[in-house]
């Protein structure tokens, strides 16, 4: 098994996590990409996705998560704005490539969010002050909320414009076979 490394980010509440996940340009430029949290026991959980196929440098905002896929640079930029202590955890970028298993982009991100100082919460350059100037996305092809044998009625989260489930179930296997190794801090 491949040994996974972690990149640690220590930030204060109200700041922005800004990471770039590199990928092989020719292979994955238009593939759908996802930002996942790794729950206890190696259980990846998708939090946000790019469109399918992924659009070049088109920001997708889902709640406080903003994804931008730069095809010409072969990188997925992930921002989590207005960080909260509860956002602390282990994250990863993956590329969906059905029917094969998702491809994990190294390194994993170990995010540690601590309470800010009593001063203005977003007063440094990593703060969230400017991030909401991004025009809200109206994308409809984000990752599905839920799958069931029949159709699904759903509403988008209040903080995003429109999120809807693709017509068919995405037939994916989990990345755990690739990533079942100890985590190193």
């Amino acid at each position: 098994a491949t040994k996974l490394t972690e990149e640690k980010y220590e930030l204060k509440e109200g700041q922005t996590l800004d990471v770039k996940c590199d990928y092989t340009l020719e292979k994955f430029a238009s593939s759908q990409k996802a930002w996942q949290i790794i729950r206890d026991g190696e259980m990846p959980k998708t939090l946000a996705c790019t469109e399918r196929p992924s659009k070049n440098s088109h920001p997708v905002q889902v709640g406080r998560i903003i994804l931008e896929d730069y095809h010409d640079h072969g990188l997925l930029r992930v921002r989590m704005v207005n960080l909260q202590v509860e956002d602390s955890g282990l994250y990863q970028c993956v590329i969906y490539q059905p029917p094969k298993e998702p491809h994990m982009l190294f390194d994993r991100i170990r995010l540690v969010v601590t309470k800010g100082f009593s001063g203005t919460p977003g007063s440094n350059e990593n703060s969230t002050q400017n991030v909401y100037k991004i025009p809200p996305t109206t994308t409809k092809a984000l990752c599905p909320l839920y799958t069931s044998p029949r159709t699904v009625t759903q509403a988008p989260p209040k903080s995003t414009a429109d999120v809807s489930t693709p017509d068919s179930e995405i037939n994916l296997t989990n990345v755990t076979d690739i990533i079942r190794v100890p985590v190193f801090n």
Partner: antibody
Framework: QVQLVQSGAEVKKPGASVKVSCKAS????????IHWVRQAPGQGLEWMGI????????SYAQKFQGRVTMTRDTSTSTVYMELSSLRSEDTAVYYC??????????????WGQGTMVTVSS | DIVMTQSPLSLPVTPGEPASISCRSS???????????LDWYLQKPGQSPQLLIY???NRASGVPDRFSGSGSGTDFTLKISRVEAEDVGVYYC?????????FGGGTKVEIK
């Protein structure tokens, strides 16, 4: 048809172990996590743990740590939950339920029919 | 662990009348992606639980539109606009914001 079919009722003595199976059909087995939830007679629902059928990794509720083991057999699309050192308080209906790891929701959209486990001397 | 508190414990209802169940969590269930990780299940007598509402306010497949979920953060409500006889059973809220998943104690809905 998407379903989870569980093994039949069991009667066990205190101190013994029980192994309940949950066979999945109608979907890609490795694409969904399987959780185990139990319900003592006349009581509420209690989450026990989760297994990722793709790699076999698990996470258990603290309360069951050391007594519960969840495994899977991908060749038969079956998940197993074994509970050891049984006591009378373990008398309950045990349910398996599926959750998708690749969808945003964590909801349990499909549940097994439940397996009654009675612990009695 | 996140503690889920449901009220009332028992809810006698009249068919055709509205009903409301409250669920409160000890920590916020709002995730960074803007979704509240709170689901509602109904367990009819002698049956397995069934999903009604997921992510706080999304109705699951096949669930009648008389059921609706609302709320954010730590306070959530399940509403039945007009109760029908088939709605009797125990309603549970469940948080899936962090492991271990935890359920509310349940609300038993019965016809008056």
């Amino acid at each position: 048809q998407v379903q989870l079919v569980q093994s039949g009722a069991e009667v066990k003595k205190p101190g013994a172990s029980v192994k309940v199976s949950c066979k999945a059909s109608g979907y890609t087995f490795t694409s969904y996590y399987i959780h185990w939830v139990r319900q003592a007679p006349g009581q509420g629902l209690e989450w026990m743990g989760i297994i990722n059928p793709s790699g076999g990794s698990t996470s258990y509720a603290q309360k069951f740590q050391g007594r519960v083991t969840m495994t899977r057999d991908t060749s038969t699309s079956t998940v197993y939950m074994e509970l050891s050192s049984l006591r009378s308080e373990d008398t309950a209906v045990y349910y398996c339920a599926r959750e998708s790891g690749y969808h945003v929701s964590t909801a349990f959209d499909i549940w097994g029919q439940g397996t009654m486990v009675t612990v009695s001397s | 662990d996140i503690v889920m508190t449901q009220s009332p414990l028992s809810l006698p209802v009249t068919p055709g009348e509205p009903a409301s169940i409250s669920c409160r969590s000890s920590q916020s269930l709002l995730h960074s992606n803007g979704y509240n990780y709170l689901d509602w299940y109904l367990q009819k007598p002698g049956q397995s639980p069934q999903l009604l509402i997921y992510l706080g306010s999304n109705r699951a497949s096949g669930v009648p539109d008389r059921f609706s979920g609302s709320g954010s953060g730590t306070d959530f409500t399940l509403k039945i606009s007009r109760v029908e006889a088939e709605d009797v059973g125990v309603y549970y809220c469940m948080q899936a914001r962090q492991l271990p998943w935890t359920f509310g104690g349940g609300t038993k809905v019965e016809i008056k």
